[in-house]
Interface confidence: medium
């Protein structure tokens, strides 16, 4: 039977709701399947149950909330109905689904190499995604930073960090690392989609040499 | 019993900074938004600020916007709002009330609206 | 920002009058609307949410009711500790706003 896969609000102003509409074999004919909303009144859902607004905008097999539909006031119960039967139902409010859109603009810059010049240490810097309020304070962002050597499979994880830049330390020299970064609202378990991936190549010791050293 | 108490009010100077208290007691400081609305004397109620500090999430009205900051020290369970820049138009009883915040409806009977208040505290510039 | 445009600002009335107040919205806020009731020198106290719902411990002859981004607060029967001030209020967007106030007062 169709299945909630996801509601998602990237910046707690709009939100989307995403299903599966898999047809198994020996399942009968369920027939269009549509989304219903309603909004926590007390202790009792009202029975006043509305369409969804916008099947379109957030792909197939969605629901799309926006602005004019998104209170992060109000609790929010969803179900999907096949031949006037339910066949999922899920309760949310809109800062339970915060995931944020990835982070943008990742750069790096050197910090320094060590004495034996084996290992180096970057600062690695990046930006809220667009939509995020943060400013107003309308939005709190952890970040998570992941990296690699380009060649092998097991990311290893920072710290989560409340600013948009990060010291990454003993990187070895002559290797090229990969670096991602997602992040999440504060307190709230739903990280977003990583950003895209920044390759850091760390050059031969010889062309970190100070200019001194040649005279 | 659900308290708020409001404190840290008095007359200050225009351009001058004031940092009022709300203490909440009764309830679970984190599982509400805290809200500041003000009222000038003689005049109607005007929403101000709010936090919630469970998320960390906050907002202002364009009016204060800029020169007011909330905050939350959970482990006290009280909020503040720091005034900077105070104008003569900020004159006005302060009040702190609890927004029942959303994410909890699993745990508590749920309802929207400004349920408790303290008894406001005055603010004159 | 949304406006809550409140009327009348002020009425007289007899006890046990039928009071009635509105409050338009500028644009939709669904249900999501209050009424709170204050009395000089005091902070306001919560009577309705959700446009409809009556706040516990608030007497029954207080009742709200919407049509579309229309929104009534109703008094069925004044009684003498009504006299006070109404404000309705909207809380659908994240910036939260109040009506100008209704004075009720004693004809």
């Known amino acids: 039977e169709p299945k909630f896969t996801k509601c998602r609000s990237p910046e707690r102003e709009t939100f989307s709701c995403h299903w599966t509409d898999e047809v198994h074999h020996g399942t009968k004919n369920l027939g269009p399947i549509q989304l219903f909303y309603t909004r926590r009144n007390t202790q009792e859902w009202t029975q006043e149950w509305k369409e969804c607004p916008d099947y379109v905008s957030a792909g197939e097999n969605s629901c799309y909330f926006n602005s004019s539909f998104t209170s992060i006031w109000i609790p929010y119960c969803i179900k999907l109905t096949s031949n006037g039967g339910t066949v999922d139902e899920k309760c949310f409010s809109v800062d339970e689904i915060v995931q944020p859109d990835p982070p943008i603009a990742l750069n790096w810059t050197l910090l320094n190499v060590s004495l034996t010049g084996i290992h180096a240490d970057i600062q690695v810097r990046w930006e809220a995604p667009r939509n995020a309020d943060i400013q107003k304070g309308w939005m709190v962002l952890e970040y998570e930073l992941q990296y690699k050597e380009v060649n092998e499979t097991k990311w290893k994880m920072m710290d989560p960090i409340l600013t948009t830049s990060v010291p990454v330390y003993s990187l070895k020299v002559d290797k090229e690392y990969e670096v991602r970064v997602r992040s999440k609202q504060r307190n709230s378990g739903n990280y977003g989609e990583f950003s895209e991936v920044l390759y850091v190549t760390l050059p031969q010791m010889s062309q970190f040499t100070c200019e001194e050293d040649f005279y | 019993e659900v308290q708020l108490v409001e404190s840290g009010g008095g007359l200050v100077q225009p351009g001058g900074s004031l940092r009022l208290s709300c203490a909440a007691s009764?309830?679970?400081?984190?599982?509400?938004?805290i809200h500041w609305v003000r009222q000038a004397p003689g005049k109607g109620l005007e929403w101000v600020a709010y936090?919630?500090?469970?998320?960390?999430?906050?907002s202002y009205a364009d009016s204060v916007k800029g020169r007011f900051t909330i905050s939350a020290d959970t482990s006290k369970n009280t909020a503040y709002l720091q005034m900077n820049s105070l104008r003569a138009e900020d004159t006005a009883v302060y009040y702190c009330?609890?927004?029942?915040?959303?994410?909890?409806?699993?745990?508590?009977?749920?309802?929207?609206?400004?349920?408790?208040w303290g008894q406001g505290t005055l603010v004159t510039v | 920002d949304i406006q809550m445009t409140q009327s009348p600002s002020s009425l007289s009335a007899s006890v046990g009058d039928r009071v009635t107040i509105t409050c338009r919205a500028s644009?939709?806020?669904?249900?999501?609307v209050a009424w709170y009731q204050q009395k000089p020198g005091k902070a306001p106290k919560l009577l309705i949410y959700?446009?409809?719902s009556l706040y516990s411990g608030v007497p029954s002859r207080f009742s709200g009711s919407r049509s579309g981004t229309d929104f009534t607060l109703t008094i069925s029967s004044l009684q003498p500790e009504d006299f006070a001030t109404y404000y309705c209020?909207?809380?659908?967007?994240?910036?939260?706003?109040f009506g100008q106030g209704t004075k009720v007062e004693i004809k």
């Open positions: 009330a609890r927004l029942q915040h959303p994410s909890w409806y699993y745990y508590q009977g749920y309802h929207s609206g400004m349920d408790y």
């Open positions: 009764g309830f679970n400081f984190s599982y509400s938004s």
């Open positions: 936090i919630s500090s469970y998320y960390g999430y906050t």
């Open positions: 644009q939709s806020v669904s249900s999501a």
């Open positions: 959700s446009a409809s």
């Open positions: 209020q909207q809380y659908w967007s994240s910036l939260i706003t």
